[in-house]
């Protein structure tokens, strides 16, 4: 059997830092037999067997033009084996980021931080903490460490599914290469990397005869479980087209009607979503959708009041108890002062 | 010569926006995390933002964090740190840093002046 | 974020004492501490990595050492060229921070 313990990465390749000395084995030989050492296609005698080094090859302060194939040799000229040497770095611990749309699963994404210039691959693993007492903390089965799966292709990145909502976990992603490993623990919990996607379907309608309404409505986002323990809060802005400034108002359900458009001009709209609780942050922008209010005179049946969901002109309370799950069904209001003085408008 | 040179600061109103640049030579850039360190006049270092090789995963301190973007171009061995809505807190000295890994600095420009003030 | 505390905040020490700084992390760091040394209107330099691994070309009067939360710098015997400030800084964590600093200068 070969004196020489076969590194991770490819056969027939071996390792060494720059800078460092390095040591190349002979495979083909039975440790500490004498060899003779020359450099592929070069004749020059690099190590006679005189040595008192067996079966290796020292090289001391290595750079990149020691890298390339080697051969040895026995006494007997017959061939010792072929090795080529790569040079690189140990790992450096890879930074690690996770984040959940759901309130189920989440994922976590790496990268080097130092190119080794090696091969690398990367384990990916997790436990879920389990803090027992004041300051004690236990391991059981149920804790794990788990595998976390990683995506196929070599895209760099694990998905934790079935993962609870309230629980602690530490993620462990450990770069490995032929010089080395080096870990990367990351404390994460759901509550704070819960980042929803976008709410869907977002559309801008007119509320015909009425020329500073808009009503918008949209969806959950697909991600978000569809029996959802967890609710969304939304939160819409709207602007005239070219106006620099956003409105923000945060609707009660899955559509608002803007009481305060500006007449004849289209209105970009947009909607983020976020857990009905606090929990994590916001969801990014969904993709705009624009409307234009009605320019047309008040339809001959003016729509029941309950029919039109527009919000309170007092700014919504943020830390007002959560509301039940959100409901399409528009809460009945009376008429306010803008809508009589939208009317006066409309009807002069 | 291994050497970091930055560049681009000056003084700036409050709410203005500058971009800092910082240029590597004589290591091979793309192989290494980058860094933003500040030093406030008379102050003590405060880390401000870091980015791996690839630039896929960047890191902001708190302070700096939706104002400031950090990003690197590999082919110009350039790292730049774009400071936007600047405040008078964030006057400093602005210094680029190497690698080797992630937090740990073993390589260091000159610093750049970067003054808010109206 | 991982919060670090250096004392003394300054000293003054004569030419040959043996100095030395300690840095204290709120929470286990393991070793993953370094120690800076910053001259007046310089840059920081490297000293000590990994809280006790010398630096090439840093002189061998410089030593770390500690793991976990407690850290100490030595300077064995304290020369001119060493008036600076001397900063302790994690890297644990994935957002580094630095101690506040100590001043050292020569009685």
């Known amino acids: 059997s070969s004196p020489c313990p076969q590194a991770w990465g490819p056969p027939g390749v071996q390792y060494g830092q720059p800078g460092r000395s390095v040591k190349l084995c002979c495979p083909g030989v039975t440790a500490g037999d004498p060899v003779s050492w020359f450099r592929d296609g070069e004749p020059k005698l690099l190590q006679g067997p005189d040595s008192g080094l067996g079966h290796e090859l020292v090289l001391a302060q290595a750079d990149s033009t020691d890298e390339g194939t080697y051969i040895c040799q026995t006494l007997d000229g017959a061939l010792g084996g072929t090795v080529t040497l790569q040079l690189g770095y140990p790992p450096a611990r890879p930074v690690v980021s996770c984040q959940a749309a759901d309130y189920e699963n989440f994922s976590c994404t790496w990268s080097p931080s130092q190119i080794s210039g090696l091969p690398t691959r990367y384990l990916t693993s997790y436990r879920k903490k389990t803090v027992l007492g004041a300051d004690s903390q236990r391991r059981s089965p149920s804790t794990g460490p788990w595998p976390c799966p990683q995506d196929p292709l070599g895209a760099a990145r694990c998905v934790v599914h079935g993962a609870e909502f309230w629980s602690q976990y530490r993620i462990n992603v450990t770069e490995v290469n032929p010089l080395g490993a080096s870990t990367r623990l990351l404390d994460v919990s759901l509550q704070s990397i819960l980042r929803p996607d976008p709410p869907q379907g977002l559309r801008v309608e007119s509320v015909p005869g009425y020329p500073r309404r808009l009503r918008a409505s949209w969806t959950y986002p697909a991600s978000w479980p569809c029996q959802p323990h967890f609710l969304l809060k939304f939160r819409l802005q709207y602007r005239p087209a070219q106006h620099p400034a956003w409105s923000t108002v945060e609707p009660a359900g899955l559509e608002e009607v803007i009481t305060d458009a500006v007449a004849g001009l289209p209105h970009a709209v947009r909607v983020s979503a976020r857990d009905f609780l606090d929990a994590g942050t916001w969801s990014t922008w969904s993709p705009e959708a624009w409307g234009t209010p009605s320019t047309g005179t008040i339809p001959k049946e003016i729509p029941a009041w309950g029919q039109l969901h527009t919000q309170p002109e007092v700014e919504p309370q943020v830390d007002s108890p959560a509301p039940p799950r959100p409901s399409l069904q528009p809460h009945p209001r009376l008429l306010d002062h803008r809508d009589s003085v939208e009317q006066v408008a409309v009807l002069a | 010569e291994v050497q970091l040179l930055e560049s681009g600061g000056g003084l700036v109103q409050p709410g203005g926006s500058l971009r800092l640049s910082c240029a590597a030579s004589?290591?091979?850039?793309?192989?290494?995390?980058m860094t933003w360190v500040r030093q406030a006049p008379g102050k003590g270092l405060e880390w401000v933002s870091s980015i791996v090789p690839s630039g896929g995963h960047t890191q902001y301190a708190d302070s700096v964090k939706g104002r400031f973007t950090i990003s690197r171009d590999n082919s110009k061995n350039t790292l730049y740190l774009q400071m936007n809505s600047l405040r008078a807190e964030d006057t400093a000295v602005y210094y680029c840093?190497?690698?080797?890994?992630?937090?740990?600095?073993?390589?260091w420009g000159r610093g750049t002046l970067v003054t808010v003030s109206s | 974020d991982i919060q670090m505390t250096q004392s003394p905040s300054s000293l003054s020490a004569s030419v040959g004492d043996r100095v030395t700084i300690t840095c204290q992390a709120s929470?286990?760091?393991?070793?993953?501490l370094n120690w800076y040394q910053q001259k007046p209107g310089k840059a920081p330099k490297l000293l000590i990595y990994?809280?006790?691994n010398l630096q090439t070309g840093v002189p061998s009067r410089f030593s770390g050492s500690g793991s976990g939360t407690d850290f100490t710098f030595t300077i064995s015997s304290l020369q001119p060229e060493d008036i600076a400030t001397y900063y302790c800084s994690q890297f644990e964590s994935q957002s580094p921070t630095f101690g506040p600093g100590t001043k050292v200068d020569i009685k």
């Open positions: 840093a190497k690698g080797p890994g992630w937090g740990s600095f073993d390589l």
């Open positions: 004589g290591f091979t850039f793309s192989w290494y995390s």
């Open positions: 929470q286990d760091i393991n070793n993953y």
């Open positions: 990994d809280a006790s």
